[in-house]
Interface confidence: low
């Protein structure tokens, strides 16, 4: 991975050397700071591929989270960035460095909120509700490991000050609807659920209203089982395709893995007229190969201007430290007439898809 070295950081930037493995470094940063964690290889030797993890889940690089093999940089840190960070060897998952990070405006209990999203006098005489921090509402799909704390926020304003209520899957949502209850922080326009479990999965909608109008936002929560598993693959439909010579084809494959998977697109090939090697292993050629940094990846193989030799079996393969998963895709390539006839036949027979 490359690290965005040209990013200009406003405010303090503290680069912290990594502690010895086994030790946990306690760090406190101010809101808005750039958090920089450094994890040099033990003994100064080569480290191999690494992964940065926060609260048990792999960090996904973004414009704000810059991930490098020995360094993690979180720009414009906020309370949500507090947590347990570790740098691990990708293959063995051995923890190389461990940090406890707290982001705060001032010394306070970890559950306190900054009051920045409280309703404020906007100077408007009357008005329907509106979102005050829409940029904080971009992430509509949240996938978190079980036992984590989840907070949904819908910071809003209006005059008169609007009320906020919450729905789960379209129905009123109250504390008694879940073990452990919920925290409704009306001053922060937020819903907090601690120690989430798989039954907490669903769509959560905030409804903000006053006498002049109503606005709503829906978030989707997916709770990932704690026990690590080999990747789960889902073939995009149709998995088997017939294409006309010279056309373009796309295969889609969804990969779910809470441990960063190595994803490959492969094609079965023949070597000296044989499809398998002496040990019975099929001959394949690698078309695309990369490490995915997200829990859920929608990967696509695009074949442009296909010829007859592009026909055959393709594989979407995902590997993590627990195991391997594969999905097969078939492509047959024909001249224009043959392909049209085959498509008509398939249409009449009803499409058959491989899962």
């Amino acid at each position: 991975e490359s690290l965005g070295t040209e990013q200009r950081v406003v405010g303090r930037a503290a680069e912290v050397p990594g502690p010895e493995p086994g030790q946990q470094e306690q760090l406190v940063f101010g809101s808005g700071d750039a958090v920089e964690l450094s994890c040099p290889p033990p003994g100064g030797g080569p480290m191999g591929p690494t992964v940065w993890v926060k609260d048990g889940t792999g960090l996904v690089p973004s414009e704000r989270v810059l991930v490098g093999p020995q360094r993690l940089q979180v720009l414009n840190a906020s309370h949500e960035d507090s947590g347990a960070y570790s740098c691990r060897q990708r293959l063995t998952q051995r923890v190389l460095c461990h940090f406890s990070v707290r982001v705060t405006d001032a010394p306070s209990s970890g559950d306190d909120e900054d009051g920045e999203d409280e309703a404020e006098d906007t100077g408007v005489d009357t008005g329907a509700p509106y979102w005050t921090r829409p940029e904080r509402m971009d992430k509509k799909l949240l996938a978190v490991p079980a036992a984590n704390t989840v907070r949904f926020r819908c910071p809003a304003a209006g005059n008169p000050t609007p009320s906020i209520s919450w729905l789960k899957n379209g129905r009123e949502f109250r504390g008694e609807h879940r073990i452990g209850g919920i925290k409704l922080r009306h001053q922060q326009w937020s819903l907090v659920m601690e120690s989430v479990v798989p039954s907490d999965r669903g769509n959560y909608t905030c409804v903000v209203e006053n006498k002049f109008g109503s606005i709503r936002q829906t978030y989707t929560l997916d709770v990932l089982e704690r026990s690590p598993h080999r990747p789960i693959l889902q073939a995009g439909l149709p998995a088997n395709q017939t294409a006309v010579l010279g056309s373009d084809v796309e295969f889609h494959c969804k990969v779910y893995s809470d441990a960063q998977p190595h994803i490959q697109w492969l094609k079965h090939v023949e070597v000296n007229g044989s499809k398998v090697g002496p040990d019975g292993t099929p001959y394949v050629t690698v078309l695309k190969s990369w490490i995915s940094e997200s829990v859920e990846a929608d990967v696509r193989l695009r074949l442009a201007n296909v010829s007859e030799r592009d026909g055959g079996e393709y594989l979407c393969r995902a590997t993590n430290f627990i195991g391997v998963a594969e999905k097969a895709f078939w492509l047959s390539v024909h001249g224009p007439r043959a392909a049209e006839e085959e498509l008509v036949e398939a249409d009449e027979a009803g499409s058959v898809y491989a899962g």
């Epitope: 965005g4 056309s247 695309k288």
Partner: antibody
Framework: EIQLQQSGPELVKPGASVKVSCKAS????????MYWVKQSHGKSLEWIGY????????RDNQKFKGKATLTVDKSSSTAYMHLNSLTSEDSAVYYC?????????????WGQGTLVTVSA | QIVLTQSPALMSASPGEKVTMTCSAS?????MYWYQQKPRSSPKPWIY???NLASGVPARFSGSGSGTSYSLTISSMEAEDAATYYC?????????FGAGTKLELK
Amino acid sequence: EIQLQQSGPELVKPGASVKVSCKASGYAFTSYNMYWVKQSHGKSLEWIGYIDPYNGGTRDNQKFKGKATLTVDKSSSTAYMHLNSLTSEDSAVYYCAREGGNYEAWFAYWGQGTLVTVSA
Amino acid sequence: QIVLTQSPALMSASPGEKVTMTCSASSSVSYMYWYQQKPRSSPKPWIYLTSNLASGVPARFSGSGSGTSYSLTISSMEAEDAATYYCQQWSSNPLTFGAGTKLELK
């Protein structure tokens, strides 16, 4: 922040060649194809080709075969486009652009452009 | 190659006015993509997979279409929407762009 930083403007003579660079930062460089696009003055956009930084594989628009050569330097997360045998027709702004992740058919991030002027 | 024809080439609209521009493909395409470009700036991703707005694009924009006919619509023109809009396809090689529709503020 994902950024594509291109090299500065070039003034070259007809028949000469030029190498435009595009330094990527803020993401895993080898995970995404890098595309090159030409925009002549006051005109539309033309796709030149792309390179897969993971393996150096390229796909070119036939129109630019022999004109543009695409390469990458993985160690510096930089993509290059070499334009040869330049004529006035090659005067244009050249952009590098990164594909949009899973949506390989479009360009989600663009460099600021490099103006190449071919003049005697 | 697939030729994308954008129309009109030049149009002007008053603030609050509804705007629709079209992109016609010489052969059927699976998806259309749109970019916005302002003078002396790089193109910005605007709409992908025919109807999905790129990050930061105002909700007054929408995209639609299928086959050979696609369109970009602005429900209520604002001054900042004045720009040139390009459509693009890659359902067939080579990837091609339209010649652009220049939208001016009246």
